[in-house]
């Protein structure tokens, strides 16, 4: 990536890292308003299976691993990207490496959920306070989960699907910060590991993933009021280990693996019409990216 100054624009979709033949250090940003991609400052260490989030206008890259010809190292790293300076800086690392991690943000705190370190599949969860640059463990999940989808709705943290080391999962659970406890919620209709999970219009969406046999293109959403999962329109491409985010009332899914190919496809879901459309292509196919959107 280039080290020049990034244009000072809002509402970009950032995609960090990923995997194609080896872990990648790319940071690129898509501007849905004009369909352009920006090539930004590379991650300091290549990473796939990471997660991305934004707090206070800064982009954070959390966990993952560096799978390279020189070896394979799971990451406990937290790195912070400043869009104004187009520079990365390291923050305090997590207590353990977490590959195929999920993250969510509540009240400006980053929650790092599950993931793996070697053959260990974590149920542990830790919270990062940016103002103190500190991580602290919170209550562990009821289930070990890697390839877990994480989303925040009404200040509650949801962990959806994943892989416990033996089975791919359709189960989901919810963390209550005030009580520091997890509770199971209604299971999805479909087993999904490596799904894209996000929140749109008071619903939690789970898109794609892998059911232990095949990549999926199906999408379902959880209504917290009725506590039910309902299918919506399927994506055009089957994909697992995809990136997902919400931008201006629409869901964007980026890349992933379809069982044969590393996808460069970016699809967009319009909830008003219940349709998916191909909106752009990434500069190259990849799986296991970290994705987030800058705040206004």
């Amino acid at each position: 990536g280039s080290m020049g100054h990034a244009p000072k624009v809002g509402r970009l979709i950032y995609t960090a890292g990923g995997y194609f033949r080896q872990s990648l250090s790319y940071l690129e940003a898509y501007n849905p308003s004009d369909g352009t991609w920006l090539d930004l400052a590379d991650l300091q260490v290549p990473r796939s299976g990471l997660a991305g989030c934004v707090v206070g206008g800064l982009l954070y890259a959390v966990g993952g691993r560096n799978n390279s010809p020189d070896g394979n190292t799971d990451s406990s790293a937290l790195d912070c990207y400043n869009p104004m300076t187009n520079q990365w800086s390291p923050c305090a690392p997590m207590s353990v490496p977490r590959n195929r991690i999920g993250v969510g943000v509540i009240d400006g705190h980053i929650y790092a959920v599950g993931g793996s370190h070697g053959c260990i599949h974590h149920n542990s969860v830790e919270r990062y306070e940016p103002e103190r640059d500190e991580w602290h463990l919170v209550a562990p999940m009821l289930t070990r989960r890697i390839g877990v989808g994480v989303a925040v709705l009404n200040r509650l943290l949801y962990a959806v699907g994943g892989f416990d080391g033996t089975n791919r999962l359709n189960s989901a659970e919810c963390y209550y910060p005030e009580r520091n406890e997890w509770r199971m919620i209604t299971a999805m209709n479909t087993i999904r590991s490596g799904a894209g999970v996000c929140v749109l219009h008071n619903c939690i969406y789970a898109a794609g993933g892998y059911d232990g046999q095949d990549q999926l293109n199906s999408v379902e959403r959880y209504d917290v009021e009725t506590e039910t999962w309902t299918f919506v329109a399927p994506m055009k491409h089957r994909r697992s280990a995809l990136g997902i985010t919400v931008h201006q009332g629409r869901i964007y899914v980026l890349g992933g693996y379809d069982g044969h190919t590393f996808l460069d496809s970016v699809e967009c879901y319009d909830p008003d019409t219940d349709t998916w459309s191909e909106v752009t292509r990434m500069t190259s196919g990849r799986s296991g990216v970290g994705v987030a959107v800058t705040m206004e």
Epitope: S48, G118, G165, Y210
Partner: antibody
């Protein structure tokens, strides 16, 4: 019944290439990570490579990284090991293997092996 | 890489004997250790996974145990079909590594 059958071994000169196949039956190759493990004549076992069906990620032993490529074709239910720039020390029986239905990275299912001899 | 040091490299025993093979990991591998049996010209067969779990179909005379970074495979009463080479394997961290093997021969 789960079965793995390797083929493609043979005699090749140093610097040459070979592609090994691992045909699976009794399960979908998309349902489990596939590994290659080798055993030099009279020696022990060495893990070589693996492919993850969920993420597409591949892993390699340092001794083969950059020379060997693991892949899978789900339509043929077959995994492959493309071996380039072969060296004498790559001479071995090559096994494909997959884990069992439990939470461990140990190998419950093995093929019968195919012998690769690298010699001039 | 984690080294798995297996001992002894060979042993002679009689049918009915109790046989113990050990494997020491160069660093912590939790319980992510498996044991295999291999006969000449054949593929290895899984006996034990997760240090002490007996794989389906394996006779109960085989057992595994762990003490810290030391792992033990025990054959409680050696049978004629047990004469073979045995390998340990760690899968705790990348890359997975095997012990050098223990050949169990007839005394």
């Amino acid at each position: 019944e789960v079965q793995l059958v390797e083929s493609g071994g043979g005699l090749v000169q140093p610097g040459g290439s070979l592609r090994l196949s691992c045909a699976a039956s009794g399960f979908a190759i998309s349902a489990s990570s596939i590994h290659w493990v080798r055993q030099a004549p009279g020696k022990g076992l060495e893990w070589v490579a693996s492919i993850d069906p969920e993420t597409g990620e591949t892993l390699y032993a340092k001794s083969v990284a950059g020379r060997f490529t693991i892949s899978a074709d789900t339509s043929k239910n077959t995994a492959y090991l493309q071996m380039n720039s072969l060296r004498a020390e790559d001479t071995a029986v090559y096994y494909c293997a997959r884990r069992g239905d439990y939470g461990s990275w140990s190998f419950a299912y093995w093929g019968q092996g195919t012998l690769v001899t690298v010699s001039s | 890489d984690i080294q798995m040091t297996q001992s002894p490299s060979s042993l002679s025993a009689s049918v009915g004997d109790r046989v113990t093979i050990t494997c020491r990991a160069s660093q912590s591998v939790s319980s992510a250790v498996a044991w295999y049996q291999q006969k000449p010209g054949k593929a290895p067969k899984l006996l034990i996974y997760s240090a002490s779990s007996l794989y389906s179909g394996v006779p109960s005379r085989f057992s595994g145990s762990r003490s810290g970074t030391d792992f033990t495979l025990t054959i409680s009463s050696l049978q004629p079909e047990d004469f073979a080479t045995y390998y340990c394997q760690q899968s705790y961290s990348f890359p997975s590594t095997f012990g050098q093997g223990t050949k169990v021969e007839i005394k």
